[in-house]
């Protein structure tokens, strides 16, 4: 009866250059327990080589010379006594491509090359990319350990060298970036930047790299309020904004953070649980009223903290003028001017373009001012008759603008009575 030599091994296996592969294998050979028990030696050879002379690619026989080019990379895995001939191939090289056969030897009775079941190995170009592992999310200011590893690689062959590149690494010592692991303390400005891990097998031309975009979680650092695309100046968490009464106002609050903070507007300086007047970063007032003068707060709420800024809104108006109007009264010509403005304006009277300041020392005129609500009133009393036609003007102004009005007093009748002075405005 023919001795039974059998081998179970896949016909072909493909591995990328620089990576590892485990080829499962089992074998059987004729052996009787009453035989003497010389050691069982197994070998993997390159196809086309004569087992008696060739250097082996892998063996458990310490007396057999192993090919220098496969030394340490091709290894028998598993227990040969249990008829396991599994072959581990590490740091695969293009020149490893080819066929291999298995051989068993035990004493003088068992010597056999399994030429019918060859293993065909194909080494292809490396397309596998390394994996960059870290606990997400990256948090600004919190040190995080990152590691770079290549799926399918193993310890076999020359060591792997690593290099890390990216803006987030700029302050690191170059030595740190040559390890498979590094500790990174991300900053807000590192969000969205690229981090690359490149792997190279020492002494080989095989390199592969993976680039990841950093997703750095960070709380808002600053809040900016924009009006018509222009940022308002902020001093000590407060911004001052003068607004023309009656004008429409649209403000945009921006607080860069990741993930985006929840932005809301509040009236005044709110308590933490206050109800917002806007649940977005936009505050819209259709017509600003003087009653809205005071404060608004923009709050940026984020899982990592919150930030808020106070907007001091001052409502202003240009002076509005009623007058002047003049009439004869007992003490002389009495002219009145009414005006309103925010902030309260200054006012002056002019007679024939000459300013009338305070009260005349000679008693020729007298100025009185009073205010009621938003309106302020000023009166001018001119003593004596009119010698000729007169132009009386009143002017109101504040930092935002001015308005003036004038009346032309015509010398017509000598006795005008107490009526309104005919005037040409």
């Amino acid at each position: 009866e023919k001795p039974v030599y059998e081998l179970q091994v896949q016909k072909s296996v493909t591995v990328q250059e620089g990576l590892c592969v485990l080829v499962p294998c089992s074998f059987s050979y004729p052996w009787r327990s009453w035989y003497s028990s010389p050691p069982l030696y197994v070998y993997w050879f390159r196809d086309g080589e004569i087992p008696y002379y060739a250097e082996v690619v892998a063996t458990n026989n310490p007396d057999r010379r192993v090919k220098p080019e496969t030394q340490g990379r091709f290894r028998l895995l598993g227990d040969v006594q249990k008829k396991n001939c599994s072959l581990s191939i590490g740091d695969a090289r293009m020149e490893d491509t080819g066929s291999y056969f298995f051989r068993v030897e035990r004493g003088r009775d068992v010597k056999y090359s399994y030429q019918q079941n060859k293993l065909n190995l194909e080494v292809t170009a490396l397309i596998e990319k390394p994996d960059i592992h870290f606990l997400e999310p990256l948090e600004s200011g919190r040190p995080t350990r990152l590691s770079c590893s290549l799926p399918g690689s193993c310890e076999a062959g020359p060591p792997l060298t690593f290099s890390w590149t990216g803006n987030a690494l700029s302050p690191l010592d170059p030595e740190t970036t040559r390890s498979s692991e590094l500790t990174l303390t991300p900053r807000p400005e590192d969000h969205g930047t690229n981090l690359t891990c490149q792997m190279k097998r020492q002494g080989a031309q095989v390199t592969t790299e993976r680039t990841v975009q950093l997703n750095v979680s960070y709380a808002p650092q600053t809040i900016t309020i924009f009006r018509n695309g222009i940022a308002l100046e902020i001093l000590q968490n407060t911004s001052y904004l003068p607004v023309l009464e009656g004008q429409a106002l649209r403000l945009l609050c921006d607080a860069p953070s990741n993930p985006p903070a929840h932005l809301s507007w509040f009236q005044g300086s709110p308590a933490l649980n206050a109800t917002p007047i806007s649940n977005t970063g936009i505050l819209e007032l259709r017509r600003v009223r003087s009653a809205e003068e005071g404060g608004f707060t923009c709050r940026a709420q984020h899982p990592l903290g919150f930030l808020q800024i106070f907007l001091n809104l001052s409502v202003y108006s240009l002076p509005q003028l009623l007058g002047p109007s003049c009439s004869w009264e007992a003490e002389g010509l009495h002219c009145r001017c009414s005006f309103r403005a925010r902030p309260a304006p200054s006012l002056c009277w002019r007679l024939e373009e000459k300013p009338l300041e305070g009260n005349s020392s000679q008693g020729s005129f007298k100025v009185n001012s009073s205010s009621a609500g938003p309106w302020a009133n000023s009166s001018l009393i001119l003593h004596g008759g009119l010698s000729s036609d007169l132009k009386v003007s009143c002017k109101a102004w504040n930092i935002y603008g001015s308005q003036s009005g004038s009346v032309l007093l015509l010398q017509g009748r000598s006795n005008l009575g107490t009526g309104v002075v005919p005037a040409a405005l």
Partner: antibody, heavy 119, light 110 residues
């Protein structure tokens, strides 16, 4: 028990060819390298070449490259050596020998077969 | 080229015999082994393997046979010659093609 049984040879005419056989038994045919060795009467031994059925590998001594052709028939576990264009120089005893194992030695020999070239 | 000396070695039974074999070049194979063998051919018989890889006795070979040497110089020693040891001894190198035998040394009774 490994055995190499030789046959063929005898008296042959000059210019003709002869095919010698070496039938192997007692082992797996593909596991041995079969060598052929020439010994002229009263002379020393000369290595002609080998045939390895495991991978059909054949090696010749350059001196015999145009003289000897080694072949095999796996089904009958036989290795053949054909000697062509025979001359009296080819008259000799031809041995086949089996070489198995890493030890690299011809551990089993056939009994030899004699070739006499004469008209 | 394998040069064997002496060509003939007359000995008395029980004596020690020593045969030398010199190679024209190193016979270390590329795999690191030195395939130097010694064969004995008795009259009318096929050669028989005695020593393989310089110093290893083949199975069934008595321990009075020993081999030594390295590189290019090798020696076969028979510590106490017995009648069955008589015949022609050949050294052989199987490291480089063409494989070659030495010229032979005839061990005979004095």
């Amino acid at each position: 028990q490994v055995q190499l049984q030789q046959s063929g040879g005898g008296l042959v005419k000059p210019g003709t060819s002869v095919k010698l056989s070496c039938k192997a038994s007692g082992y797996i045919f593909t596991e041995y390298i079969i060598h052929w060795v020439k010994q002229r009467s009263g002379q020393g031994l000369e290595w002609i070449g080998w045939f390895y059925p495991g991978i059909i590998s054949i090696k010749y001594n350059e001196k015999f490259k145009d003289k000897a052709t080694l072949t095999a028939d796996k089904s009958s576990s036989t290795v053949y050596m054909e000697l062509s264009r025979l001359t009296s120089e080819d008259s000799a005893v031809y041995f086949c020998a089996g070489h198995e194992g890493y030890d690299g030695a011809m551990d089993y020999w056939g009994q030899g077969t004699s070739v006499t070239v004469s008209s | 080229l394998m040069t064997q000396t002496p060509l003939s070695l007359p000995v008395s039974l029980g004596d020690q015999a020593s045969i030398s074999c010199r190679c024209s070049q190193s016979i270390v194979h590329s795999n690191g082994n030195t395939y130097l063998e010694w064969y004995l051919q008795k009259p009318g018989q096929s050669p028989k393997l005695l020593i393989y890889r310089v110093s290893n006795r083949f199975s069934g070979v008595p321990d009075r046979f020993s081999g030594s040497g390295s590189g290019t110089d090798f020696t076969l020693k028979i510590s106490r010659v017995e009648a069955e040891d008589l015949g022609v001894y050949y050294c052989f190198q199987g490291s480089h093609v063409p494989w070659t035998f030495g010229g032979g040394t005839k061990l005979e009774i004095k």
